[in-house]
């Protein structure tokens, strides 16, 4: 079956940077993939890109730059200050639609240990929700 | 045939609102994000923000947050603008500007622009 | 944001000379998924609101003629207008359409002489 994988990393230079990156393990055909923190996307997540394998990325602050890394896993650099800052305990979550196999989201969050600058290994996380 | 219908141009004192109108026609309203664009005394185009007509979600350029606001009303298929604590420094002209069939930001068809002007 | 900067700022050139305009971004545009540059270039005539002509840097939009030809990959990019005609006289900017906020160029003024 496939799963997501979700890795969160707090930039070293910069306490407020978060770089979340996230992958797809399915044999399927990527058509969207969305990243929301605060939760699940649609459970009461906040909406923080939008990556269209055609049409472009769409992006919502404090979200800064939102890129494929391959056809199978993006990254988003997140920039906050003040009240739209994550801090180190926000939960990020990432939903791929993909064809044939649904939607699949997994969401994770800096591990409690990490010094900035280091994060876990990008390992599956749990699949939350499979559609 | 697409078209966007803007509202005609405005003479506003400083420190008053100012709202405008986008009115679409020629294709179904909330099947495209509708994106608002400035353009200073026929120089350069700055992207305002966009908002999606199905759900009425925003999305500011941070240089605009809180100066634009963003609506829609579906009942009309029109997107409006309101800009508001206005100085000189905000006279230009406005253009909606719908998101493109083949990428969100590839913007292929304009309103014919409002032009604003901010003066005592 | 993409910073994308044009030159020249302005050209002067007869009917049926090739006119080439240049525009660089920031960052790379081109998307790693399909392959394709999200770089767009739109025309405005004097007194008219900006039509696309360009997008993903080289795709034609329907109906615009032959002669307007959109190149480049990653960071550079070129309209040519092969054989300039006298309703060709506008401003042109080209536009990156990666990503959230969209930016656009300062403009290439083209006068015909």
């Known amino acids: 079956t496939p799963e997501v994988w979700v890795q969160v990393r707090m930039e070293a230079t910069e306490l407020s940077s978060f770089t979340i990156r996230c992958g797809f393990l399915g044999s399927g055909s990527i058509s969207l993939v969305t990243v929301s923190w605060g939760g699940p996307n649609g459970a009461g997540g906040t909406t923080l890109a939008v990556l269209h394998p055609e049409r472009g990325i769409r992006q919502w602050a404090p979200a800064r730059q939102a890129r494929w890394e391959t056809q199978s896993s993006i990254s988003l650099i997140l920039e906050g200050s003040g009240a739209s800052s994550p801090c180190a305990n926000t939960t990020f979550c990432c939903k791929f639609a993909s064809f044939p196999e649904g939607s699949w989201e997994a969401c994770g969050s800096l591990p409690p240990s990490s010094d900035p600058g280091l994060s876990a290994p990008p390992t599956p996380a749990p699949i939350l929700r499979a559609d | 045939e697409v078209q966007l219908q803007q509202s005609g141009p405005e003479l506003v004192k400083p420190g008053t609102s100012v709202k405008i109108s986008c009115k679409a026609s020629?294709?179904?309203?909330?099947?495209?994000?509708m994106n608002w664009v400035r353009q200073s005394h026929g120089k350069s185009l700055e992207w305002i923000g966009e908002?999606?007509?199905?759900?009425?979600?925003?999305n500011y350029n941070q240089n605009f947050k809180g100066k634009a606001t963003l609506t829609v009303d579906k009942s009309s298929n029109t997107a409006y603008m309101e800009l508001r604590s206005l100085t000189s420094e905000d006279s230009a002209v406005f253009y909606c500007?719908?998101?493109?069939?083949?990428?969100?930001?590839?913007?292929?068809?304009w309103g014919q622009g409002t032009s604003v002007t901010v003066s005592s | 944001d993409i910073v994308m900067t044009q030159s020249p700022s302005s050209l002067a050139m007869s009917v049926g000379q090739k006119v080439t305009m240049s525009c660089k971004s920031s960052?790379?545009?081109?998307?790693?998924?399909?392959?394709?540059?999200?770089l767009a270039w739109y025309q405005q005539k004097p007194g008219q609101s900006p039509k696309l002509l360009v997008y993903?840097?080289?795709t034609r939009e329907s109906g615009v003629p032959d002669r307007f030809i959109g190149s480049g990959s990653g960071t550079d990019f070129t309209l040519t207008i092969t054989s300039v005609q006298a309703e060709d006289l506008a401003d042109y900017f080209c536009?990156?359409?990666?990503?959230?906020?969209?930016?656009f160029g300062g403009g290439t003024k083209l006068e015909i002489n």
């Open positions: 500007a719908r998101e493109g069939v083949s990428s969100y930001y590839a913007m292929d068809y």
């Open positions: 020629g294709y179904t309203f909330t099947d495209y994000y």
């Open positions: 908002i999606n007509p199905k759900n009425g979600d925003t």
């Open positions: 960052q790379s545009l081109l998307n790693s998924f399909n392959q394709k540059n999200f």
């Open positions: 993903f840097a080289s």
């Open positions: 536009q990156q359409h990666h990503s959230t906020p969209p930016t």
